[in-house]
Interface confidence: low
């Protein structure tokens, strides 16, 4: 069998064998090599010379196999937009950003561009857990039975009601969705409003 042609090679049907690593150059009707991630085209291919690639300069990157004649400029995560860095820019990857704690992504264009403060969840509710932190605003759900949450907060979680007996105490008032159980010492007298029921 004939050896596979290496770029540059003629292509009559305007397609190249390896779409990821080659591209069709229409002026000469040839397939040429793309440049690997972290590099850019320093000299275009011709019919007798393949693409010449060079490494991206500091503070610039190209993420994919490309035929770009420049590298993309690294951009910092903009704290004014509520973003913080989770991984630095490299020649092969742009700066990785996420929303700062307590914020969610309010504007998305291939990546998050603007974060806003998460809404508070009122007492008796908590924010529904999401697969990915910072992806959307809070959706508040009621505390499940036996739990309470007593603040207005974007991040507070519902806590289980205190079990008085575990502390050697007795329940003075039951817990609600917004408040914990009230416990008392079993030797303490009943509150005055309850003592009348005990008269003989």
């Amino acid at each position: 069998s004939q050896p596979q042609a290496v770029p540059p090679y003629a292509s009559e049907n305007q397609t190249c064998r390896d779409q990821e690593k080659e591209y069709y150059e229409p002026q000469h009707r040839i397939c040429c090599s793309r440049c690997p991630p972290g590099t850019y085209v320093s000299a275009k291919c011709s019919r007798i010379r393949d693409t010449v690639c060079a490494t991206c300069a500091e503070n610039s990157y190209n993420e994919h196999w490309n035929y770009l004649t420049i590298c993309q400029l690294c951009r910092p995560c903009d704290p004014v937009m509520g973003l913080e860095e989770i991984a630095p820019c490299t020649s092969k990857r742009k700066t990785q950003c996420r929303c700062q704690p307590g914020m969610f992504c309010a504007a998305w264009a291939l990546e998050c561009t603007h974060c806003e403060l998460l809404s508070d969840c009122p007492p008796g509710t908590e924010a529904e857990l999401k697969d990915e932190v910072g992806k959307g605003n809070n959706h508040c759900v009621p505390c499940k039975a036996g739990h309470f949450q007593n603040t207005s907060s974007p991040s507070a979680r519902c806590q289980p009601h205190t079990r008085c007996e575990n502390q050697g105490l007795v329940e003075a008032a039951p817990g609600t969705a917004q408040s914990d159980t009230t416990c008392k010492n079993p030797l303490e007298p009943l509150p005055p409003e309850m003592s009348g029921t005990m008269l003989m």
């Epitope: 002026q27 000469h28 000299a43 275009k44 011709s46 019919r47 007798i48 010379r49 004649t69």
Partner: antibody
Framework: EVQLVESGGGLVKPGGSLRLSCAAS????????MSWVRQAPGKGLEWVGR??????????DYAAPVKGRITISRDDSKNTLYLQMNSLKTEDTAVYYC?????????WGQGTLVTVSS | DIQMTQSPSSLSASVGDRVTITCRTS??????LNWYQQKPGKAPKLLIY???SLQSGVPSRFSGSGSGTDFTLTISSLQPEDFATYYC?????????FGQGTKVEIK
């Protein structure tokens, strides 16, 4: 059909200046590196210089015998290549061709004669 | 600069002859060598690029071979319209350089 048409040649005295033009059509001019090649009467071919595309920086390279005396430029909006020649010498007498530069010189103009003589 | 040495500088041949022109470079240029044909009063015409690739529209009697420093242009059966001057040209490095030419004349 690709066409390259040079103009601007003529008789000029030593030390004089001349600007040659090359009008291009039939291909994507702003995607092409372009070169000037010259040929003295009865002699062989000699590369003069080249200009790259704007996307490749629009930079120029010149042959040693003409460096500092010539400037190659391009106007992509007019599909035109230029060769500005200053401080001309008798040894610059030649037919000047513009060519597409893809590593090889695929397309050539008909040439324009520059004669440097007192 | 890379020096190009073409030989012979001229040759006489008859129609139907097989003609071979050689080009030697002062350093290795891989396969970045091109061949041109020029007739009097006309611009050069590209025949072969990349040492052995035939330019579109050029008759198949023209062929090129070689790599490194030694290259050959062959005309398998010389035709009347082939009487011209032939130049080799390297595009491996700047400045590009040409051979001095080989004039093919009628015997």
């Amino acid at each position: 059909e690709v066409q390259l048409v040079e103009s601007g040649g003529g008789l000029v005295k030593p030390g004089g200046s001349l600007r040659l033009s090359c009008a291009a059509s039939g291909f994507t001019f702003n995607d092409a590196w372009m070169s000037w090649v010259r040929q003295a009467p009865g002699k062989g071919l000699e590369w003069v210089g080249r200009i790259k595309t704007k996307t490749d920086g629009g930079t120029t390279d010149y042959a040693a015998p003409v460096k500092g005396r010539i400037t190659i430029s391009r106007d992509d909006s007019k599909n035109t290549l230029y060769l500005q020649m200053n401080s001309l010498k008798t040894e610059d007498t030649a037919v000047y061709y513009c060519t597409t530069d893809y590593g090889d010189y695929e397309y050539w103009g008909q040439g324009t004669l520059v004669t440097v003589s007192s | 600069d890379i020096q190009m040495t073409q030989s012979p500088s001229s040759l006489s041949a008859s129609v139907g002859d097989r003609v071979t022109i050689t080009c030697r470079t002062s350093q290795s240029i891989s396969r970045y060598l091109n061949w041109y044909q020029q007739k009097p009063g006309k611009a050069p015409k590209l025949l072969i690029y990349g040492a052995s690739s035939l330019q579109s529209g050029v008759p198949s009697r023209f062929s090129g071979s070689g790599s490194g420093t030694d290259f050959t242009l062959t005309i398998s059966s010389l035709q009347p319209e082939d009487f011209a001057t032939y130049y080799c040209h390297q595009s491996y490095s700047t400045p590009p350089t040409f051979g001095q030419g080989t004039k093919v004349e009628i015997k």
